[in-house]
């Protein structure tokens, strides 16, 4: 290559006037956080405060009732899932503040960001279990009278947690820390490298199992429940049903942006402008999904206030009232015609 005109190049975008420190950002604007990141930080802060305190309170209230009240078991497990996810927030918050720099190591990178996905799967599987329970109470009251017990509820929760852990494994396995050369930064993210098909498969499975299929089945489930409830013109309180419907609805609302951007990114070329734009919105979508981790206690309190008329009781007793309502009286195993009628009336509005 001796014949190449190998002179000092004119880079155009380089000049010789200043020096650049090792830690100086590559462009002048990168000292300030982007608007989506600032919004994500605000959401993370609120979610952490409300989520930790709210879910701790829910756990405290329901833990005492879980031995005898099945509803308490459901809400206890949901609160534990949310509480666990909230514990990762200070680390995620710190990372965003440092322009997504990840100084916490590889193990933390695999575990902490995966907690929100564990929460997603645990929550939706628990909500599916709760919804199945509501469905059976309305349509199979006699079966519930005979078999619906705390033991079965705990088994159902254990299955939900086990499945959630299994479904979170792909995300966990593909999370890696990458140390970028310039600007000097350690990043925590998923790297499928050669396997774009696997990346798409993971995104599709996440969308289908964590969103579309539950959305379809739960919509059908609650359509039937609500139709039956309205047709029977329920005389007793529908508070548990209302709370569960609100929790289910919030799940889908807050996971929607994450799921949409996730599936889009898996099908886009990583260097395309759309992909890069979506990547900038990633933290905001994650933070929006994280609202799920603090919304349930808020729903319970709002529901409790609604049922009380105004906030007369203390917060724990208000929550206890909402979360530990028992749907089936299990005093008698002998069924007469009148007992069955009573049962139907008691469960038609749950």
């Amino acid at each position: 290559m001796d014949s190449f005109n190998y002179t000092t190049p004119d880079y155009g975008h380089y000049d010789d006037k200043d020096t650049l420190d090792l830690n100086t950002p590559v462009d002048k604007t990168s000292n300030t956080l982007r608007v989506p990141d600032i919004l994500a930080l605000v959401i993370f802060a609120v979610v952490f405060l409300v989520g930790v305190l709210g879910n701790a309170l829910v756990v405290w209230v329901t833990a005492f009732e879980a031995k005898r009240t099945i509803n308490a078991i459901w809400f206890l497990n949901l609160a534990v899932a949310d509480f666990l996810s909230c514990l990762a927030l200070p680390i995620l918050f710190t990372s965003i503040v440092q322009h997504h720099h990840w100084p916490f190591g590889g193990a933390a990178c695999s575990i902490l960001p995966s907690l929100i996905l564990l929460n997603m799967y645990a929550s939706i599987l628990l909500l599916a279990t709760i919804s199945a329970d509501r469905f059976l109470l309305v349509f199979k009251p006699i079966w519930c009278q005979n078999f619906r017990g705390a033991g079965l509820a705990w088994i159902a929760c254990a299955v939900a947690w086990g499945l959630a852990l299994l479904l979170t494994i792909p995300s966990f396995l593909y999370r890696v820390v990458r140390e970028e050369y310039f600007p000097p930064k350690v990043l925590c993210g998923v790297d499928y490298s050669h396997d774009k098909r696997r990346e798409r498969a993971v995104a599709i499975v996440r969308l289908v199992l964590g969103f579309l299929w539950p959305l379809l089945t739960l919509t059908i489930c609650y359509t039937f429940i609500l139709l039956r409830t309205w047709s029977r013109r329920a005389t007793r309180s529908t508070k548990t049903l209302k709370v569960v419907v609100a929790v289910v609805a919030s799940f889908f609302i807050f996971w929607l942006p994450y799921q949409v951007t996730g599936i889009m990114m898996s099908f886009l070329e990583p260097s395309s402008p759309t992909f890069l734009l979506l990547k900038k919105l990633d933290s905001l979508c994650v933070s929006f999904a994280y609202i799920n981790c603090c919304i349930n206690p808020i729903i319970y309190v709002v529901a409790g206030q609604g049922f009380q008329g105004r906030l007369r009781k203390s917060l724990p007793s208000l929550l206890r009232n909402v979360l530990t309502e028992e749907s089936v009286v299990r005093e008698s195993k002998s069924f007469t015609r009148s007992t069955v009628d009573t049962m139907a009336q008691k469960t038609q509005a749950v």
């Epitope: 020096t19 420190d21 090792l22 050369y181 000097p184 930064k185 990583p270």
Partner: antibody
């Protein structure tokens, strides 16, 4: 024109230390990072690390972190690499190479635009 | 570390032929800013390497337009449209997205 003039060939014993130099001319020394690259006979290239002459901050390949020390002398526009605890595997040609730096631009110091002619280090007892 | 795999190791060509060298990385080289920091160097016998292509497809100052680069993520290619005698030597791909910076094992372009 840009020149990176490296010191002459070195012969050292196993366990000894050596200090290689790279004198820069034809550009503002403090505006370019200086990298060091190793090439063993008939083999590929291996990155050792870099130094920012302006701030004296440096970054090393973990593989060389304990044995390589990069320094600069701004007054003479010279970069140095001190290599300690030499082994036979250290026998190689060592290159210094500069990278252009960005100012208010999205381009970074990502490629070696000029290389020194190389210094041959032979480790032999 | 990112492993850079070059193929072929040796590429015998006739002058005026087209030549293509492939470089594959063990990890994605897409930087958080969207760029792929993949570069190509040519080393002639007894000389130091010289920069040909930077950031996948940008020809360095003085490099003829018969050299072109392409690729993204993990798969990259250097193409020489009409090989000339001065193009012979060992071609190295190199990545500077991640630390440590790494190089391919080299592809020797030689006369058939």
């Amino acid at each position: 024109q840009v020149q990176l003039q490296q010191s002459g060939a070195e012969l050292a014993k196993p366990g000894a230390s050596v200090k290689l130099s790279c004198k820069a001319s034809g550009y503002t020394f403090t505006n370019y990072w200086m990298h060091w690259v190793k090439q063993r006979p008939g083999q590929g290239l291996e990155w050792i690390g870099y130094i920012n002459p302006s701030s004296a901050s440096s970054k090393y390949n973990q593989k060389f972190k304990d044995r390589a020390t990069l320094t600069t002398d701004k007054s003479s526009s010279t970069a140095f690499m001190h290599l300690s605890s030499l082994t036979y595997e250290d026998s190689a040609v060592y290159y210094c190479a500069r990278v252009p730096l960005p100012y208010g631009s999205s381009y970074g110091p990502y490629f070696f635009d000029f290389w020194g002619q190389g210094t041959t280090l032979t480790v032999s007892s | 570390d990112v492993v850079m795999t070059q193929t072929p190791l040796s590429l015998p060509v006739s002058l005026g032929d087209h030549a293509s060298i492939s470089c594959r990385s063990s990890q994605s080289l897409i930087h958080s800013n969207g760029n792929n920091y993949l570069h190509w160097y040519l080393q002639k016998p007894g000389q130091s390497p010289k920069l040909l292509i930077y950031t996948v497809s940008n020809r360095f100052s003085g490099v003829p337009d018969r050299f072109s680069g392409s690729g993204s993520g993990t798969d990259f290619t250097l193409k020489i449209s009409r090989v000339e005698a001065e193009d012979l030597g060992v071609y190295f791909c190199s990545q500077s997205t991640l630390v440590p910076l790494t190089f391919g094992s080299g592809t020797k372009l030689e006369i058939k």
